[in-house]
């Protein structure tokens, strides 16, 4: 029998190279069955992980899976960091692991994205 | 030339509502977010948020949240900020400005939209 | 919140002589620091971006410097049509945040 638990799916030590001034979409992949729970995300901060708080975050369905997705526009250099999903299920916490933002500092003008860049994010 | 053209000044009563207008020309409008500001009587700067005319995703200052709402239109090249329930602390002139990227930075500013909240 | 302090408030300058204006950041912003100019009635112009680019079309007396904390606007030798607020901003980090600016004044 397929458990009911939700389940989120960010694989452990994985990451994303990005650059400032762009935009960005941080996904959560979330399995649940009947209800889906209250997701949060939140930045880590040395061993504690910050809450963040009115950011902007959609969901986006596919299939058998949901995405909670944390919005950047655009990415500013101190986003830079690891940042966990959390789901409040039954009144217990499920996290997620640790997803890291490595963003570069892009500073020559002439380093910016190409026309469709930004269109194709 | 790249313009940003603003609505007109806007007088209104404490309690009512705007949308400031902001029309993009002379570049790709889809190529840059758009950024507003207020300044109030002349003095500091304020960010109110920034849109990506592509998909109308917004980051907001958390003082303004709530406050003003910015929208695009992508048809016309415009984009808008709705500004609801005024009081006179909201009485100030906005600016729109487009965002240069990596770093982002302000690198063409409308001529301001000049808000007069007074009974 | 980081907060950008611009000092002096005011000064005045006679034409030909060198200005140096500060901006101090409450914590490091590396160098996503901006400089806008803004002549009286009008809006903001852009002249420096990543704390030293000038930008297109600025006269090369604006030079921008500082990395971290601190940043300065000199101008090499003031004009008339220099007389304007100074403000400068950060993006480095959300809220992105403006100092008081500095308005330079002709004697």
């Known amino acids: 029998k397929e458990s009911c638990d939700v389940q989120l799916y960010i694989k452990r030590q994985s990451y994303h190279s990005i650059f400032a001034g762009d935009p960005f979409k941080l996904e959560c992949p979330v399995k649940y069955c009947a209800h889906r729970p209250q997701v949060t995300w939140c930045k880590l901060n040395g061993t504690t992980c910050v809450k963040l708080e009115g950011r902007h975050t959609s969901w986006k369905q596919e299939k058998n899976l949901s995405f909670f997705i944390l919005h950047f526009e655009p990415v500013l250099p101190s986003d830079n960091g690891s940042y966990r999903c959390s789901a409040n299920f039954l009144s217990a916490i499920i996290e997620s692991h640790s997803t890291t933002l490595y963003v570069t500092d892009v500073k020559s003008a002439s380093e910016r994205p190409s026309k469709d860049e930004m269109a194709s994010r | 030339e790249v313009q940003l053209q603003q609505s007109g000044p806007e007088l209104v009563q404490p309690g009512a509502s705007v949308k400031i207008s902001c029309k993009a020309s002379?570049?790709?409008?889809?190529?840059?977010?758009m950024i507003w500001v207020k300044q109030s009587h002349g003095k500091s700067l304020e960010w109110i948020g920034n849109i990506n005319p592509n998909n109308g995703g917004t980051t907001y200052n958390q003082k303004f949240k709530g406050k003003a709402t910015l929208t695009v239109d992508k048809s016309s090249s415009t984009a808008y900020m709705g500004l609801p329930s005024l009081t006179s602390e909201d009485s100030a002139v906005y600016y729109c400005?487009?965002?240069?990227?990596?770093?982002?930075?302000?690198?063409?500013w409308g001529q301001g939209t000049t808000l007069t909240v007074s009974s | 919140n980081i907060v950008m302090t611009q000092s002096p408030k005011s000064m005045s300058m006679s034409v030909g002589e060198r200005v140096t204006l500060s901006c101090k950041a409450s914590?490091?912003?590396?160098?996503?620091v901006s400089w806008y100019q803004q002549k009286p009635e009008q809006s903001p112009k852009l002249l420096i971006y990543?704390?030293?680019n000038r930008y297109t079309g600025v006269p090369d007396r604006f030079t921008g410097s500082g990395s971290a904390t601190d940043f300065t606007l000199t101008i090499s030798s003031v004009q008339a049509e220099d007389l304007a607020d100074y403000h400068c901003?950060?993006?480095?980090?959300?809220?992105?945040?403006f100092g008081a600016g500095t308005k330079l004044e002709l004697i």
């Open positions: 990543g704390a030293s």
């Open positions: 002379g570049y790709t409008f889809t190529d840059y977010y």
């Open positions: 400005a487009r965002g240069g990227l990596r770093p982002l930075y302000f690198d063409y």
């Open positions: 901003g950060q993006s480095y980090s959300y809220p992105l945040t």
């Open positions: 914590e490091n912003v590396d160098t996503y």
